[in-house]
């Protein structure tokens, strides 16, 4: 047999070398680049276990697009062909609660997880006789790289062998800690920098495969919180880095997500973006904002990927989009998952399993409202999947997707065995579709959430309510005393008000300047390499927020430390939820805070407020009747008509879709 | 700056009438929705009602349809909540709130408060069984 090369197992404390040897059917299907479904023999262990895989058709496109640029800089647009892909997901016969995450694109890898243990499988380099390692996931030598605060053992859950009938695969695949019974979709973008790329031999098919074969392993963590990952865009920075990465991990992941911000979301929609980095920040694997998964400003992370496998490189990305999902860590809480860690474990341990308090946290984001994006099933024109009927994705073709049939006798409206709408039906699902009928325009779809924020309407042709949008940025709100900034009124009253309870409000500004001037975790203007630093006056309304009149302590599922400051006759109150380095400290005065006349907060720092750029004259452009919105046109107040509230209307703008209908009595009484 | 101001609350006995006056200054009310939400102690404010800009649509709690009416004078820059047959658990603050840009109608769902930028005070309503 062939030895493996140095290269290949210098990372492993302990491996095996097997010949797996595939099953065949006697009924074989038509020739095709790779099969929908195939099962292999293969030892681990000493043990034979035979492995049922189907091909992950709710992963990747058939209008894979790729964004790269060229020597100029220009936007390159790429939509290769890969709807026979090679990305399997699946389970081993007879063992409980197992799942499998492989690809059998040029021989077995990816990971196998059973019940006490996950391995993975990769072919050997130069065997001619289909040779492959198998290790123990825990036999990988990892830097002890952290999101955090340090490692805890977890206590062992037992699992209970149940007998029971085999299950199908998409039984098998859904019955794992389901959290909670309606299926999320989180549709993941994910960004490649340039260090990353060069370090794949500036080889794009490489890349891509490898993100993929990360997204199929993501989607197989995932699918035990009933959460399938869809992976709707790649960007490669071929031609250099369209951000600063120079700094600590924070300021990385600032510039990340204003860039995704500005740039990226108008380019495809997508619920949260993760940045793929060589560049390390000296022993931090990653960072990612807490519960902003729906957000257009923070839903996204950063992550390391240096001398580690795609396979341990999963359960960071895991972890910091957990972290999107609403995850805290599980340090120092009451959490199990069956391993000796966790993959919210701060520690990056490399862990393939989410823990019972992250099935909580998901559930608390779900509940608070702050997971509604993940309801939509990606569109066809968005989801990289192959089409197929039957997958609860509605695919290139579709129409609509009731599921399995059993499913689809539930569903008035859809047909499933085609995957098209019944003949009386308009539409089958979607904000603006009821009793298999599109809902009259001025339908209200999405109402206001804030002062800041505009409403959306039916147009009545569509299934889909318009796209949100909201103020644009820099408009004044609270009587001038803040201003917009996406889509929220930002002022330290209601910051503080989150926090410590209705009652609360901003401590005065001498506590600011004397608590964030000490440079600690109570107070500070950041982070920066591996130490707090201190708020110049000038910047210490920007730093750790300080409350006064607090009458309730905070509860967030993570109990944080309070910190009670005396200053000229009053108490400041600030908090540290110690989330981690990995983690932006929610106890922060909000980015876009008005923080003196004419400023804002942004980074820390108490900037001019001209960064915002607003730009609209309301008296000017919406004739004193109406508001900007964040596509810069105007939202008409009731009795004016868009696009310029000139004339005497029904409200709304060129965005929000009609406000009124004669005929609409939606809920009329 | 819009204000708006409540009155008309007080203590009454169950199956009593009782009607809640809102005046709104700073702004004519013609462009404005205008709503009532409620708040007993130790719960959630809820929704009571609201009547579109136009006056054209009204959308009413289920926990008080039938007995609940709203109507608006743009005139007066006035809205008014006729509340009949008062149940024990009608007892909570009421507020009022308007907003320009919720139009108040075409809805399929209850409004929520954060649909309205404007609030009065508040008025207490008691009705004692």
């Known amino acids: 047999a062939a030895r493996p090369g140095f290269q290949q197992t210098s990372h492993l404390s302990s491996y095996e070398i097997i010949t797996p040897w595939r099953l065949t059917r006697e009924r074989r299907e038509a020739p095709r680049p790779y099969s929908k479904q195939v099962s292999y023999v293969i030892q681990a262990e000493g043990k034979e276990h035979i492995i049922h895989l189907e091909r992950n058709k709710d992963l990747l496109p058939e209008d894979f697009v790729v964004y790269t640029y060229n020597k100029e800089g220009t936007l390159i647009t790429d939509h290769p062909n890969i709807q026979n892909h090679c990305h399997y997901r699946g389970y081993v016969e007879g063992v409980h609660n197992s799942s499998i995450a492989l690809s059998d694109c040029f021989g077995l890898r990816g990971l196998l997880h059973l019940e006490n243990a996950s391995y993975g499988i990769e072919p050997l380099q130069n065997s001619s006789h289909f040779e492959h390692i198998i290790y123990r996931m825990d036999d990988v030598y990892k830097e002890p790289l952290k999101c955090g605060v340090s490692n805890k053992d977890i206590e062992k859950e037992t699992a209970k062998d149940e007998e029971e009938e085999p299950p199908s695969m998409t039984q098998l695949l859904r019955r794992r800690r389901a959290v909670l019974p309606q299926t999320r979709y989180v549709e993941l973008f994910i960004v490649v920098d340039k260090e990353r790329y060069d370090m794949m031999g500036r080889n794009q098919t490489a890349v891509r495969e490898e993100m993929i074969l990360l997204a199929n392993y993501l989607d197989s963590m995932y699918i035990m919180l009933n959460i399938r990952i869809v992976l709707v865009g790649l960007e490669i920075w071929t031609n250099g880095n369209l951000i600063n990465i120079v700094g600590g991990a924070g300021d990385v992941l600032g510039n990340f997500v204003q860039w995704r911000e500005k740039f990226l979301i108008t380019r495809r929609r997508h619920d949260s973006a993760q940045l793929v980095l060589k560049k390390g920040f000296g022993g931090t694997a990653g960072m990612a904002f807490v519960g902003t998964v729906c957000s257009r400003s923070h839903a996204g992370g950063i992550n390391v990927f240096g001398q580690i496998t795609v396979e341990t490189f999963a359960s960071i990305v895991a972890h910091e989009l957990g972290h999107n999902l609403g995850m805290n860590h599980d340090d120092g809480r009451d959490c199990s998952c069956g391993a000796k860690s966790c993959i919210m474990n701060s520690g990056a341990s490399g862990s393939r399993n989410f823990s019972s308090c992250s099935a909580e946290d998901f559930e608390k984001l779900t509940l608070n409202k702050g997971g509604n994006c993940l309801l939509n099933i990606p569109k066809p024109d968005e989801a990289y999947s192959a089409p197929s009927c039957g997958n609860k994705l509605v695919d290139a073709g579709e129409e609509c997707d009731c599921g399995t049939p059993k499913e689809c006798e539930l569903d008035p409206c859809c047909e499933g065995s085609t995957c098209k709408l019944k003949s009386f039906a308009e539409c089958a699902y979607g904000d603006c579709c009821k009793d298999c009928r599109f809902l009259p325009g001025g339908t209200l779809c999405r109402g206001k959430t804030s002062e800041c924020d505009v409403p959306e309407y039916c147009n009545g042709s569509s299934q889909f309510c318009q796209p949100d949008v909201f103020i644009q940025n820099g408009y004044p709100c609270q009587n001038n005393k803040a201003y917009c900034y996406n889509g929220m009124c930002q002022y330290y009253d209601a910051q503080c008000q989150v926090i410590f309870g209705s009652k609360a409000k901003a401590a005065p500004k001498d506590c600011f300047i004397e608590v964030n001037s000490k440079g600690d975790r109570f107070g500070n203007c950041g982070f920066s390499g591996n130490e707090y630093k201190k708020c110049a006056t000038g910047n210490a309304l920007c730093g750790k927020l300080q409350c006064e009149n607090v009458q309730e302590i905070p509860v967030f599922g993570i109990v944080p430390a309070i910190i009670q400051t005396p200053s000229r006759g009053t108490k400041c109150w600030g908090v540290d939820f110690q989330l981690g380095s990995d983690v932006p400290d929610p106890g922060m005065v909000n980015e876009g805070t008005k923080c003196g006349a004419g400023k804002i907060c942004r980074n820390f720092q108490c900037v001019d407020a001209s960064v915002l750029n607003y730009d609209c004259d309301v008296q000017k452009k919406c004739h004193g009747h109406g508001v900007c919105n964040s596509n810069k046109n105007c939202h008409c107040e009731n009795g004016w008509a868009p696009p310029n509230c000139e004339t005497k209307g029904y409200g709304g703008s060129v965005d929000s879709g009609p406000t009124y209908n004669e005929m609409n009595t939606a809920l009329r009484d | 700056e819009v204000q708006l101001v409540e009155s008309g609350g007080g203590l009454v006995q169950a199956g009593d009438s009782l009607r809640l006056s809102c005046a709104v200054s700073?702004?004519?009310?013609?462009?404005?929705?205008v709503g009532w939400f409620r708040q007993a102690p130790g719960k959630e404010r809820e929704f009571v009602a609201v009547i579109s800009w136009t006056g054209g649509s009204t959308y009413f709690a289920d926990s008080v349809k039938g007995r609940f009416t709203i109507s608006r004078d743009n005139a007066k820059n006035t809205v008014y909540l006729q509340m009949n047959n008062l149940k024990s658990e009608d007892t909570a603050v009421y507020y009022c709130t308007a907003d320009r840009f919720t139009t108040g109608s075409g809805r399929t769902s209850y409004p929520r408060p954060s649909e309205f930028d404007h609030w009065g005070q508040g008025i207490q309503v008691t009705v004692s069984s």
């Open positions: 700073g702004r004519t009310i013609s462009s404005y929705a």
